[in-house]
């Protein structure tokens, strides 16, 4: 609070100098609905642990996840779902129905993304859940499935 | 490295004052898979040349492209693809299958987007490739097809 | 213009200290094509009024809207549309066709997003229009339908 007009140190303390970001690609071998990620991606001011991004500086974060699906259509429609979880709670989800004609086709591509703008505290975890993880084709699309966060404004 | 606590010039030199951004709309007449863009969009600290955005300040960039397709369905499914290229190498792609019922319908709308968070050096080129450029309807949707970048954190 | 190298106050006046942002979820009961939003979302340096976000600080803004649709397919295809309006003018739209097989199915999920990077003046209004607002299922997806803006670079 308050106005610190010409007091430089006061102004600087409020400046958004701290920056934190992450950009991780999905791990090669997925075997559960909670996605895991390659630890050798871009990580700065954010930790990666057990499938979670762990926040190290409090503030307002922009979070975005994008997944590329490849579905071998069965003879019914398929609902693809992407869930963004904060501290193991679903914060936001995106759903798309594919194979809606009910025809068994060779394959169908679908791309799904989800974003979030939220205040996150230190040690908050960010993770992604996908019911149909078997449709995330990491051999064809190893670079396409990503989870990214960046700090927009740190807490004063 | 090091702590420059009360040394204002030291602090300021590390501050993210430099900002670069671009927001370009697709050119009216497309005749090849590499998309070209209207030069009269928003450009600040980024150049446009021959279908490429050319980076002028090194740093961590957020890149996002969104395309609006309008497909006159043939009697087979159609795979729409959007590729983000960095220096003529595919960095990330998004694919969606439309017209999957195999029925010749009047038209089908589809929207496809792709984002990227990446460190880019000076003179790095950013471009977009689309297999089926004929489905990007620039007469109906002149404002919908865009390529945008902004510098999130400049290199110290 | 001009170079103010070591003049700290000059440098600081140009620094991106001002930050503005919003992240609003769609209102529970929708009854018109112009969407209304919950006022109890995240609002900082941006006002909410009558379905509009109202800009309070001039600058370059990143605007993003994401909507989750749930369509009970009729026996014809359905075009879902999301329009981003600036001062009541359509600035950008996204369209997707669902139920394209023409079969009456139980339900089809579709997710639609749209972003914009634009210079906005004080009192500029940002709003969202959806023809088929009846397909935005706020009981199933109260958190999924959001409008967000953040100031990337304030005007010098």
């Amino acid at each position: 609070g308050g106005n610190c007009s010409e007091d430089l140190l006061c102004i600087l303390k409020r400046a958004p100098f701290k920056k934190s970001w992450a950009y991780l690609q999905v791990a090669k071998h997925l075997n559960k609905t909670k996605l895991s990620w390659n630890k050798d991606g871009i990580l700065h001011g954010v930790r990666y642990q057990d499938g979670n991004l762990v926040i190290q500086f409090p503030g307002l974060y922009f979070i975005i996840c994008q997944l590329q699906f490849l579905v071998q259509c069965p003879n019914n429609s398929v609902d693809l779902k992407l869930e963004l979880l904060i501290n193991k709670h679903i914060k936001k989800q995106a759903l798309v129905t594919v194979c809606e004609s009910g025809m068994q086709t060779k394959h169908v591509y679908q791309n799904l993304s989800q974003f979030l703008l939220d205040y996150l505290q230190v040690n908050t975890t960010v993770s992604v859940n996908v019911d149909t993880f078997q449709y995330i084709d990491t051999s064809t699309f190893p670079l396409e499935n990503v989870l990214s966060v960046f700090l927009y404004s740190n807490s004063d | 490295g090091g702590n420059c606590s009360e040394d204002l010039l030291c602090i300021l030199k590390r501050a993210p004052f430099k900002k670069s951004w671009a927001y370009l709309q697709v050119a009216k007449h497309l005749n090849k898979t590499k998309l070209s863009w209207n030069k009269d969009g928003i450009l600040h600290g980024v150049r446009y040349q021959d279908g490429n955005l050319v980076i002028q300040f090194p740093g961590l960039y957020f890149i996002i492209c969104q395309l609006q397709f309008l497909v006159q369905c043939p009697n087979n499914s159609v795979d729409l693809k959007l590729e983000l290229l960095i220096n003529k190498h595919i960095k990330k792609q998004a694919l969606v299958t439309v017209c999957e019922s195999g029925m010749q319908t009047k038209h089908v709308y589809q929207n496809l987007s792709q984002f990227l968070l990446d460190y880019l050096q000076v003179n790095t080129t950013v471009s977009v490739n689309v297999d089926t450029f004929q489905y990007i309807d620039t007469s109906t949707f002149p404002l919908e097809n865009v390529l945008s970048v902004f510098l999130y954190s400049n290199s110290d | 213009g001009g170079n103010c190298s070591e003049d700290l106050l000059c440098i600081l006046k140009r620094a991106p200290f001002k930050k503005s942002w919003a992240y609003l979820q769609v209102a529970k009961h929708l009854n018109k094509t112009k969407l209304s939003w919950n006022k109890d979302g995240i609002l900082h340096g941006v006002r909410y009024q009558d379905g509009n976000l109202v800009i309070q600080f001039p600058g370059l803004y990143f605007i993003i809207c994401q909507l989750q649709f749930l369509v009970q397919c009729p026996n014809n295809s359905v075009d879902l549309k999301l329009e981003l309006l600036i001062n009541k003018h359509i600035k950008k739209q996204a369209l997707v066709t669902v139920c394209e097989s023409g079969m009456q199915t139980k339900h089809v999920y579709q997710n639609l997003s749209q972003f914009l990077l634009d210079y906005l003046q004080v009192n500029t209004t940002v709003s969202v229009n959806v023809d088929t607002f009846q397909y935005i299922d706020t009981s199933t997806f109260p958190l999924e339908n959001v409008l967000s803006v953040f100031l990337y670079s304030n005007s010098d």
């Epitope: 084709d137 990491t138 064809t140 670079l143 | 090849k32 590499k34 190498h89 595919i90 490739n129 297999d131 | -």
Partner: antibody, heavy 124, light 110 residues
């Protein structure tokens, strides 16, 4: 080091379906992408298609309606089926490793390991 | 998909340099740096000589070099040797996620 060996009939009747198998030794089939290429006598190379370990495929548009490729990771083999054969399909058929590395970007190192080829003749 | 365009034949004397061109379109050679070159001796399988426009696999002589400008790629062989006599094929990745080959060039060492 990876080696490839094509196998299948040397003679196919017109209108029948050609079936070829490529056996991979010295490496796992799951780690790479695999292509088929053919070469009519005295002519140039023609790319037929590729298959990923997941079974996803890309085919030459001019052959797409007739081509089916599959992969059997348990046998370290991948296969090509080409239907409605005609005399124009007479050629040497090669299998090859389609070497892509997904690092900072997608790097395509080309078709870096080839089988020795198998001659297929279409005749009644 | 149309084949890339190569000259049918080129020739040179031992010790000389020759260049083989490969012209594609803005949907293949022009858009990606995914151009490869292959050498094929009679009755043998092709051998990869250059990948990604100008890179040599290990074991390939540095007499072989590649370049690209616009929609045209080039293979240059310097210090020609008799064993270089063979057919050479260029190849490019395409926007359709496929490979396309050139028609081939017969190199004769005089």
């Amino acid at each position: 080091q990876v080696q490839l060996q094509e196998s299948g009939p040397g003679l196919v009747k017109p209108s029948e379906t050609l079936s070829l198998t490529c056996t991979v030794s010295g490496g796992s089939i799951s780690s790479y992408i695999w292509s088929w290429i053919r070469q009519p006598a005295g002519k140039g190379l023609e790319w037929i298609g590729r298959i990923y370990a997941s079974g996803n495929t890309n085919y030459n548009p001019s052959l797409k309606s007739r081509v089916t490729m599959s992969v059997d990771t348990s046998k370290n083999q991948f296969s090509l089926k080409l239907s409605s054969m005609t005399a124009a399909d007479t050629a040497v058929y090669y299998c090859a490793r389609d070497y892509r590395v997904a690092g900072t970007y997608y790097y395509y190192y080309g078709l870096d390991v080839w089988g020795q080829g198998t001659t297929v003749t279409v005749s009644s | 998909q149309s084949a890339l365009t190569q000259p049918a034949s080129v020739s040179g004397s031992p010790g000389q340099s020759i260049t083989i061109s490969c012209t594609g379109t803005s949907s293949d050679v022009g858009v990606y740096d995914y151009v490869s070159w292959y050498q094929q001796h009679p009755g043998k399988a092709p051998k990869l000589m250059i990948y990604e426009v100008s890179n040599r696999p290990s074991g390939v002589s540095n007499r072989f070099s590649g370049s690209k400008s616009g929609n045209t790629a080039s293979l240059t062989i310097s210090g020609l040797q008799t064993e270089d006599e063979a057919d050479y094929y260029c190849s490019s990745y395409t926007s359709r996620s496929t490979w396309v080959f050139g028609g081939g060039t017969k190199l004769t060492v005089l």
